[in-house]
Interface confidence: medium
């Protein structure tokens, strides 16, 4: 079986998928579902997954969830929260994705793949 995907490849794949679901998109993503905001720091892949995994029935983000599963080293299930969540702030999925995308591009440019 193939070995693990290099972090740089997984990050590019995640960026490309986030671009796919946001490009020229004005309709509310996932019917305007709200998710917990996260701190965009170390461990953000797991935190992002913990937030997005609570959105159900939204096919637009299935692939994003799958890529994040590959980037997060531990098992994540719905209802699970880490200290990285800003628990008093909920934002729309579309804004969450846009914030995450901008941060990931910054990481990629700086060569921070892990």
């Amino acid at each position: 079986s193939p070995g693990p995907v290099p972090p740089s490849t997984a990050l590019r794949e995640l960026i490309e998928e986030l671009v796919n679901i946001t490009q020229n998109q004005k309709a509310p993503l996932c019917n305007g579902s709200m998710v917990w905001s996260i701190n965009l720091t170390a461990g953000m892949y797991c935190a992002a997954l913990e937030s997005l995994i609570n959105v159900s029935g939204c096919s637009a983000i299935y692939r994003t969830q799958r890529i994040l599963h590959g980037l997060c080293p531990h098992k994540v299930s719905a209802g699970q929260f880490s200290s990285l969540h800003v628990r008093d702030t909920k934002i729309e999925v579309a804004q969450f994705v846009k914030d995450l995308l901008l941060h990931l591009k910054k990481l990629f440019r700086e060569g921070q793949f892990n």
Partner: antibody
């Protein structure tokens, strides 16, 4: 000043090939999504295709009438966009414009094609 | 393939309001963009993301969108606004661009 300058147009026979270039200046080319748009004489605008920035996957999409015949590429080190046109047909005769599809790509924004070149004329005729 | 539909021509007198429509099935979820093209010149973006006006575009240009219809409105049209106007958007995937057939605006 943001600027796009196309070159490489000219007269070519049906079945022939041509490569157009678009030199960009005044903005961070590597961040930008770039498009080609054409306009046949006396007709409307027609989207030809688009290439994303490398950081956004470098994905290339083509309009159905040119898919398989035209190839879009970019050289970020030279700030240049290319359109390789093969198996040309008389109906490919048009002014070809390059345009920035996303100068704000760095910020995850999409502004539409907000800067255009002056265009280069491609004539396909026997 | 996906299409955007515009009226071929619109005529108004100077000072009147011109409205140009653009219809497409994906417009409820995808933004519309409007371009002005004067004879022999490259297109110029006048409205982006349905309603936003780039810097340098006069305030008389505005855009709106409802359902499958986007509208470009020129309030108090002037003789210099006479041009071809094209709407642009993408198909539902966002991957393929498409222009409307264009509308010739006559201000006489």
């Amino acid at each position: 000043e943001v600027q796009l300058v196309e070159s490489g147009g000219g007269l070519v026979k049906p079945g022939g090939s041509l490569r157009l270039s678009c030199a960009a200046s005044g903005f961070t080319f590597s961040n930008a999504w770039m498009s080609w748009v054409r306009q046949a004489p006396g007709k409307g605008l027609e989207w030809v295709g688009r290439i994303r920035s490398k950081i956004d996957g470098g994905t290339i999409n083509y309009a159905a009438p040119v898919k398989g015949r035209f190839t879009i590429s970019r050289d970020d080190s030279k700030n240049t966009l290319y359109l390789q046109m093969n198996s040309l047909k008389t109906e490919d005769t048009a002014v070809y414009y390059c345009a920035t599809d996303q100068v704000g790509a760095y910020y995850g924004d999409y502004y539409g094609m907000d800067v255009w070149g002056q265009g280069t004329l491609v004539t396909v005729s026997s | 393939s996906y299409e955007l539909t515009q009226p071929p021509s619109v005529s108004v007198s100077p000072g009147q309001t011109a409205r140009i429509t653009c219809s497409g099935d994906a417009l409820p979820e995808k933004y519309a963009y409007w371009y002005q093209q004067k004879s022999g010149q490259a297109p110029v973006l006048v409205i982006y993301e349905d309603t936003k006006r780039p810097s340098g575009i006069p305030e008389r240009f505005s855009g709106s969108s409802s359902g499958t219809m986007a509208t470009l409105t020129i309030s108090g049209a002037q003789v210099e606004d006479e041009a071809d106007y094209y709407c642009y958007s993408t198909d539902s995937s966002g991957n393929h661009g498409v222009f409307g057939g264009g509308t010739k605006l006559t201000v006489l």
